[in-house]
Interface confidence: medium
């Protein structure tokens, strides 16, 4: 490690004094110190002499001697004070640039160590420091502002008390650069707007960023609007707000509005659409078919989409019959708002009963009037079958009645033996009745059909079965002739309970 003579950490001299600093090392040595006038340098092998015969306050600073060839990089230092009664400060740099949250060293060096007790840091023009400015002072190095913030980008002066009065240094400009994450954040309110001609409207475009240097504007279609800007600063963000107030809207105000903000990192934009209408409107629609078919016992949700302006003043679901005067339970009706002008209304019908088939109407009202949308709900049933033996026009006839929805198809089977249900091996004959007679077909009710099978003579060791089926299921009835008369067998499983 090099050695400096005089071997003291600090040296205090008066202006005009001669100062000689000698550094001796094992190999060649080099001096490093503040850039200042009047120094002469003399090197002789392993020693180097720095000297001046006219020291000034500008020579105040720390002089370091290093040995470039030393692998350990050892150095020695001495701090020189040139105490000038008129110049308490030696400012090494008048501009300091740091990034936010770094420490910023303002290099005003005190020329007299005795003055340390009375030093302070102020902003130029006597302004106090920003609140939360955390700083420390070292007479060798100056003032350090710890974890500098962008807002602390100011001009500073170092102040020292000399003989009861404050003496300021020349100013040091601190530039604290923000680390800007990206373009400004944007909001455009509302996301969509509808107004009747003549009404008032307001559109608010606001942008915020950690840095004050950004631009924001609002444009209508492709025209930039001239709107006064309101500025604010909170939550450590700069905010710029443009508010467009329209007292009486007209059709020319309609169209696309874009809020655009930009900074050095780039541009952000967001848009909304403004509709101007002649009068109030109320539109009801459904993505579902208005004619619904559901199997009995299952559930159904009826959904209505409403587009309205102004907002709804009333709405409800109504059951229009034909079965009973029951009304949908309010707890089964549900409303969700997609956005300001569009809503979805849902009626839940769980585990549908036969008496719940019929017409359901959704009614809504706004200043534009009443509107209704009606659903027709028909329940599907698997067929129920019954067979009787009768004489028609003197001929023995098997009469099969089948009831269900949709309309059942009828098939007759004749099979050998007595059985509850004909299976393939037993079948002797099959007759399809493509056009059974419709006995009843009222809306929302089951369809009842009748099929006749004329039988000249009943074979007593045989079974006659009427089968009916539709899209929901099937039903059957087995007729077994007995010498003592006809015997019928409805299938065990068909005890229909909705």
């Amino acid at each position: 490690i090099p050695v400096i003579e005089p071997s003291v950490p600090e040296l205090v001299v008066k202006p005009g004094a001669t100062v000689t600093l000698r550094c001796v090392g094992n190999g060649s040595v080099e001096w490093d110190g503040p850039p200042s006038p009047h120094w002469t340098l003399y090197s002789d092998g392993s020693s180097s002499i720095l000297s001046t015969n006219n020291a000034t306050f500008q020579n105040t600073g720390t002089y370091r001697c290093t040995e470039p060839g030393d692998p350990l990089g050892g150095s020695a230092a001495i701090h020189l004070y040139v105490k000038d009664p008129a110049r308490p400060w030696n400012v090494l740099a008048q501009e300091v640039v740091v990034f936010e949250d770094q420490d910023a060293l303002l290099p005003c060096l005190l020329t007299d160590p005795v003055l340390e007790a009375g030093v302070s840091l102020v902003r130029v023009r006597g302004r106090p420091l920003m609140r939360h400015t955390n700083y420390s002072f070292s007479p060798w190095h100056g003032f350090t502002i710890h974890r500098a913030k962008f807002i602390q980008s100011q001009d500073y002066q170092c102040s020292a008390l000399m003989g009861g009065r404050k003496v300021m240094s020349i100013s040091i400009r601190l530039k604290v650069q923000k680390v800007i994450p990206g373009p400004p954040a944007l909001t455009l309110v509302p996301a969509e707007l509808v107004r009747i001609r003549g009404e008032a409207a307001q559109i608010v475009c606001s942008a915020s960023s950690v840095d004050v240097n950004f631009d924001v504007f609002l444009q209508h279609n492709n025209t930039k609007l001239a709107i006064p800007q309101q500025s604010d600063f909170h939550n450590n963000r700069y905010q710029k707000v443009l508010t467009l107030n329209l007292d009486q809207v007209d059709f020319q105000h309609a169209g696309n509005y874009s809020c655009v903000a930009s900074n050095v990192q780039g541009k952000h934009s967001t848009s909304m659409f403004f509709r101007v209408v002649e009068s109030a409107y109320l539109n009801l629609s459904s993505e579902q078919n208005l004619i619904q078919e559901v199997t009995v016992g299952e559930g159904l949700n009826l959904k209505v989409m409403v587009e309205a302006y102004p907002g709804l003043q009333g709405f409800n679901w109504t059951y229009l019959g034909p079965f009973s005067d029951h009304q949908p339970e309010p707890k089964l009706a549900n409303a969700t708002t997609k956005d300001t002008y569009r809503h979805t209304f849902t009626l839940s019908l769980p585990r549908l009963k036969p008496s719940e088939a019929g017409r359901y109407s959704f009614l809504a009202r706004n200043p534009g009037g009443w509107r209704a949308l009606t659903f027709e709900l028909t329940l599907r049933y698997p067929p129920e079958v019954s067979v009787i033996w009768t004489f028609i026009n003197g001929s023995g006839t098997l009469l099969c009645a089948a009831s269900g929805y949709p309309q059942p198809n009828v098939t007759w089977l004749q099979c050998s033996g007595h059985t509850d249900r004909c299976d393939e091996a037993q079948v002797l004959q099959v007759w399809d009745d493509p056009y059974p007679e419709v006995l009843s077909q009222e809306p929302f009710h089951k369809v009842t059909v009748q099929s006749l099978l004329t039988v000249e003579t009943l074979e007593h060791n045989q079974t006659y079965e009427c089968r009916a089926h539709n899209s929901v299921g099937s039903g059957s009835w087995a007729f077994i002739p007995i010498s003592a008369g006809a015997h019928t067998h409805p299938p065990d499983e068909f005890l229909f309970t909705p």
């Epitope: 302070s120 102020v122 006597g126 302004r127 106090p128 920003m130 100011q154």
Partner: antibody, heavy 119, light 113 residues
């Protein structure tokens, strides 16, 4: 909530000194500069100077230099303003005011202390 | 020192009507370093201490109604009250703090007609 409670009214002879106190509560006393502003009867506002309660460093308006001394006692969160060599035109209400961010604005004010200088 | 001049010195206003107070400085209050304009507005209601209304040209202080707004640039500034209410009576002061000593305008007395 933030409060600045000042000492009571004073009547002084010309040439005397007066020391007005300002006790802060509801916030960290050392975190905000304190300013002193005065208002002569029926007149406007006049800034006198500031003190940094954290370090005690001060800055006075040139008009009051040599006559005013601003001090603080952090243990009791109190700032003081002493004005010496009083003259009759020093008769005024003296306000302490908290500095919001350093160099103003003054977001909270004391209720004021009336100092009357009369022979 | 920077001289602050307010006009008018007295302002009679009908409740619900707007009001405007002007303030002029003898030199620019714009700090070219940070882009801020160091002008504040205070209201001193009768028998009370001053209270902060607007700071750094246009920022409303906490709790101040949005009917108060500040604007201007360089050396000419305006405080606007969109709809005056009875509680707004008092003396309004502008204050510069671009450099110390801070200086105040002479005040504008707002009274209800």
């Amino acid at each position: 909530q933030v409060q600045l409670e000042q000492s009571g009214a004073e009547v002084k002879r010309p040439g005397a000194s007066v020391k007005v106190s300002c006790k802060a509560s509801g916030y960290t006393f050392t975190g905000y500069y304190m300013h002193w502003v005065r208002q002569a009867p029926g007149q406007g506002l006049e800034w006198m100077g500031w003190i940094n309660p954290n370090r005690g460093d001060t800055n006075y308006a040139q008009k009051f230099q040599g006559r005013v001394t601003m001090t603080r006692d952090t243990s009791i969160s109190t700032a003081y303003m002493e004005l010496s060599r009083l003259r009759s035109d020093d008769t005024a209400v003296y306000y302490c005011a908290r500095d919001l961010e350093g160099g103003g604005p003054f977001d909270y004010w004391g209720q004021g202390t009336l100092v009357t200088v009369s022979s | 020192d920077i001289v602050m001049t307010q006009t008018p010195l007295s302002l009679p206003v009908t409740p619900g009507e707007p009001a405007s107070i002007s303030c002029r400085s003898s030199q620019s209050l714009l700090d070219s370093d940070d882009g801020n304009t160091y002008l504040d507005w205070y209201l001193q209601k009768p028998g009370q201490s001053p209270q902060l209304l607007i700071y750094t040209l246009s920022y409303r202080a906490s709790g101040v109604p949005d009917r108060f707004s500040g604007s201007g640039s360089g050396t000419d500034f305006t405080l606007k009250i969109s709809r005056v209410e009875a509680e707004d009576v008092g003396v309004y002061y502008c204050m510069q703090r671009i450099e110390f000593p801070s200086t105040f305008g002479q005040g504008t007395r707002l009274e209800i007609k």
